[in-house]
Interface confidence: medium
């Protein structure tokens, strides 16, 4: 039975040209995290494997930095980076947990972070 929940940074915004940390946290389970995938709508951004470390998708090598922790730092933001991001936690023995973050990249200098929220 899957008892865990994914807590994410929720709806967030950031300035064009800046950077943002995408962060998820798995709680309420003792399952072992074997791998975390970071995806953007229809593309893979990066993978963090418990044994092998980080794989950054070649398309994003120049703009994505691993961490902090299992999170991901997205740099040199453009308006095209606006959209949904997913953290996919592969765990044993529970299976797969998915969290969602919505990022809005703003032209203006006003970029406020949204509230945290949970996805069961």
């Amino acid at each position: 039975m899957m008892t865990g929940t994914i807590e994410t940074t929720g709806n967030i915004s950031a300035e064009k040209g800046g950077s943002i940390i995408l962060q998820c946290h798995l709680s309420s389970t003792t399952a072992q995290v074997t791998q975390v995938n970071w995806e953007q709508q229809d593309q893979l951004l990066a993978i963090c494997n418990a044994d092998l470390g980080w794989h950054i998708s070649p398309s994003f090598k120049d703009r994505v930095a691993p961490g902090p922790g299992l999170g991901l730092t997205l740099q040199s933001l453009t308006v095209n980076d606006t959209g949904e991001y997913f953290c996919i936690y592969h765990t044993y023995p529970d299976g797969t947990y998915t969290g969602r973050i919505f990022l809005e990249v703003l032209e203006s200098s006003v970029a406020e972070h949204g509230a945290r929220f949970q996805i069961p």
Epitope: Q41, L44, N49, D51
Partner: antibody, heavy 118, light 107 residues
Framework: QLQLQESGPGLVKPSETLSLTCTVS??????????WGWIRQPPGKGLEWIGY???????YYNPSLKSRVTISVDTSKNQFSLKLSSVTAADTAVYYC??????????WGQGTLVTVSS | EIVLTQSPGTLSLSPGERATLSCRAS???????LAWYQQKPGQAPRLLIY???SRATGIPDRFSGSGSGTDFTLTISRLEPEDFAVYYC????????FGQGTKLEIK
């Protein structure tokens, strides 16, 4: 355990397009655990990576073949495919499909020989 | 592009002996990104070692991998008749490349 099976014509004429399909069983091609790749091996020679696709559709190709390669995925059929255009005799090889964890290739098809000849 | 050079090209040994196969990279490779495969005639390659030193599922413990940076080694501690095959190293940097292979043959 994953099983992969290549299928497609064994003979292709020069300048035409080579088309192969890989059918995955024992697991879902929509798993975010895997990349789905193609590797080839000319007779008596070593291995050359062609490219891979992620289930969401993003692809990455060997730069030396990029202009001629297209890899696509059909999640409804649990298959992925390779198209290699403008083939020459140098493209004659055993073509393998394989699953990749992003670092290495853990499950392989048995391979299919494709000969380019008129 | 990272070029992998394997040596020797052919290694002739007898069952029961120890085999040491070398793989040298043209530039430094993260240990996480180095794997070894075994290929027998008419068969697909089989993953033996990943992450430079971790054995894949079902691989006997007579196979071991070691190394870091530019120099990696596959060791078969005591050769069995079924171990005679071609061995390839493979790395993942920004793209995958394979070594040219080492043929392990019966002396």
């Amino acid at each position: 355990q994953l099983q992969l099976q290549e299928s497609g014509p064994g003979l292709v004429k020069p300048s035409e397009t080579l088309s192969l399909t890989c059918t995955v069983s024992g697991g879902s091609i929509s798993s975010s655990r895997y990349f789905w790749g193609w590797i080839r091996q000319p007779p008596g020679k070593g291995l050359e990576w062609i490219g891979y696709i992620y289930y969401r559709g993003s692809t990455y190709y060997n730069p030396s073949l990029k202009s001629r390669v297209t890899i696509s995925v059909d999640t409804s059929k649990n298959q992925f495919s390779l198209k290699l255009s403008s083939v020459t005799a140098a493209d004659t090889a055993v073509y393998y499909c394989a699953s990749s964890s992003a670092w290495y290739f853990d499950y392989w098809g048995q391979g299919t020989l494709v000969t380019v000849s008129s | 592009e990272i070029v992998l050079t394997q040596s020797p090209g052919t290694l002739s040994l007898s069952p029961g002996e120890r085999a040491t196969l070398s793989c040298r990279a043209s530039q430094s490779v993260s240990s996480s990104y180095l794997a070894w495969y075994q290929q027998k005639p008419g068969q697909a390659p089989r993953l033996l070692i990943y992450g430079a030193s971790s054995r894949a599922t079902g691989i006997p413990d007579r196979f071991s991998g070691s190394g870091s940076g530019t120099d990696f080694t596959l060791t078969i501690s005591r050769l069995e008749p079924e171990d005679f095959a071609v061995y390839y190293c493979q790395q993942y940097g920004s793209l995958y490349t394979f070594g040219q292979g080492t043929k392990l043959e019966i002396k």
